[in-house]
Interface confidence: low
């Protein structure tokens, strides 16, 4: 269900380049594809090549992203290009000045001294952002949002963005500073990982993050049920980054359980993080349990 | 505070080798960026090139990518620059600067240290 | 690579002038651009970055300006400690080229 043509505007249009760049990355670290046939692999790097390049056009001169070239960039898509983009570095030749240039500016341009990284044109589509959506912890959710982003960025882009070091640590101090203050478990869960990706969730700040699970196993607030898989993915990678493999199985199954395959409307960030999660167990995870996910690739026709 | 301490005066036969460290101190080490910059005497300067410290990770200005080679070692807090094949061309003071604020620039600058070739 | 053209190369002021120096890129860098001022014998010393933030401790009286291609710095009522080269310096793909610099005087 997750190989997709991507179109329309810069919003839409990595709508449809997530869930082919997040299946591809999933069955080439599970090693499936021979389920597939290999020739499924190259059409759907195709349709990445498509959705990059397609991306490009929504690229503004200061490097930023925004749904229309006229438009006031967006501090969230920009991070999230740079997030897919990271991911997609390894699949389809990605232009580093293209990644490193929207990297540039979000440290440049949309963090505030304090570490906080600001939006000042949020997205059209809102259903694109998860559970960052009406979030009411937004300076904790976005800045952990976007620093995830940038750590995933920083291998590819810490020699031309200089500052990249220093901006990844101040995000991470405001994080720390507020996250014992935190009310949301989605919200601890994503700004969890990206502590735990800087070897910051300790201490307390972990006994919140491991205490605020429900019975052990999910991440979870009233409503959304796809915000709830997004917050548990986020969560699950906090746990792989910890080594904590006590707490995983429990989680794992629970994520498993969802049968929660991606697609549909609003679906971009769960579609995103579980299998970034899923992929990133069956990779860290010592003798861990097959997980039979029904991952059905369907190339669009032409 | 940050410093960024170089050793000291060479004088180097052409042909040989050469190599200067900066040892820093005040900070963490491996969330800072080195770069090292040349100045001919009388003259401007030069972006020689930058390495992460944490990563190892360098990149070079091309005019310099035969004749300089950047290392760093976390546990000494010391980052290198070995010139080689020296000539009277590579006659300069030759200076590490560090990173780590927002600045997209050189905060903090070692003291130089002057590399002299002659027979 | 991107050429970095500082004008003038030099230039003699008095204490309590104001000068002006520019810097002009071959290409767009957008606001990563930096000044630092090196005083005879001794490293150079970080002024401003990102076109027009001073850096900690630079006095109010040096300020810095413009986008994309053309850049000033600019230095109300000269002080004696002001003299020196200042060199312009891009932070816009490697590698992150200087200006010629300009050397400012005492009249």
């Known amino acids: 269900h997750l190989i997709v043509t991507p179109s329309g505007c810069g919003e839409q249009n990595m709508i449809g380049m997530t869930p082919t760049v997040i299946a591809v990355h999933y069955l080439d670290e599970t090693e499936q594809w021979e389920k597939f046939g290999l020739e499924k692999r190259q059409g759907a790097l195709e349709l990445i090549k498509k959705g990059y390049t397609q991306q490009l056009a929504f690229r503004q001169p200061s490097s930023a992203f925004a749904a229309f070239v006229k438009r006031a960039p967006s501090t969230w898509l920009t991070a999230y290009v740079v997030k897919v983009f990271s991911l997609a570095v390894n699949l389809i030749a990605i232009d580093s000045q293209v990644l490193c240039g929207a990297v540039k500016w979000l440290i440049l341009e949309k963090q505030k001294p304090d570490g906080v990284f600001q939006e000042d044109a949020p997205v059209i589509h809102q259903e694109m952002i998860g559970g960052l959506r009406n979030n009411n912890e937004k300076d904790m959710a976005l800045t952990a949002f976007v620093l995830i982003s940038l750590q995933e960025a920083k291998d590819i882009c810490e020699e031309q963005v200089n500052s990249l070091p220093g901006s990844i640590t101040k995000a991470g101090d405001f994080l720390e500073a507020n996250y014992m203050n935190l009310q949301r478990s989605y919200t601890v869960a994503i700004a969890g990982y990206a502590l735990a990706q800087m070897g910051r969730l300790k201490g307390p700040l972990l006994n919140k993050f491991l205490t605020t699970a429900k019975d052990k196993n999910r991440w979870e607030d009233p409503g959304k049920q796809l915000y709830n898989v997004e917050a548990t993915s986020y969560a699950l990678l906090a746990l792989l980054q910890l080594k904590d493999f006590d707490f995983v199985p429990p989680v794992v199954r629970w994520l498993n359980e969802q049968r929660y395959y991606g697609g549909g409307y609003g679906s971009t960030q769960a579609t995103f993080m579980v299998f970034q999660a899923l992929a990133q167990y069956q990779k860290d995870a010592p003798d861990h349990q097959e997980l039979n996910l029904d991952v059905s690739l369907q190339l669009p026709s032409r | 505070q940050v410093q960024l301490q170089q050793s000291g005066a060479e004088l180097v036969r052409p042909g040989t080798s050469v190599k200067v460290s900066c040892k820093a101190s005040g900070h963490s080490f491996t969330n800072y960026l080195i770069e090292w910059v040349k100045q001919r005497p009388g003259q401007g300067l030069e972006w020689i090139g930058v390495?992460?410290?944490?990563?190892?990770?360098?990149n070079y200005n091309e005019k310099f990518k035969v004749k300089a080679t950047l290392t760093a070692d976390k546990s000494s807090s010391t980052a290198y620059m070995q010139l080689s094949s020296l000539t009277s061309e590579d006659s300069a003071v030759y200076f590490c600067?560090?990173?780590?604020?927002?600045?997209?620039?050189?905060?903090?600058w070692g003291q130089g240290t002057s590399v002299t070739v002659s027979s | 690579d991107i050429q970095m053209t500082q004008s003038p190369a030099s230039l003699s002021a008095s204490v309590g002038e104001t000068v002006t120096i520019a810097c002009r890129a071959s290409?767009?860098?957008?606001?990563?651009l930096a000044w630092y001022l090196q005083k005879e014998g001794k490293s150079p010393q970080l002024l401003v970055s990102?076109?027009?933030t001073l850096a900690d401790g630079v006095p109010s009286r040096f300020s810095g300006g413009g986008s994309g291609t053309q850049f000033s710095l600019k230095i109300n009522s000269l002080q004696p400690e002001d003299f020196g080269t200042f060199y312009c310096q891009h932070h816009y793909g490697i590698p992150y080229t200087f200006g010629g610099g300009t050397k400012l005087e005492i009249k």
């Open positions: 990102k076109a027009k």
């Open positions: 600067a560090s990173y780590y604020s927002n600045s997209y620039a050189m905060d903090y």
């Open positions: 290409e767009n860098i957008y606001s990563y």
């Open positions: 390495i992460n410290p944490g990563s190892g990770g360098t």
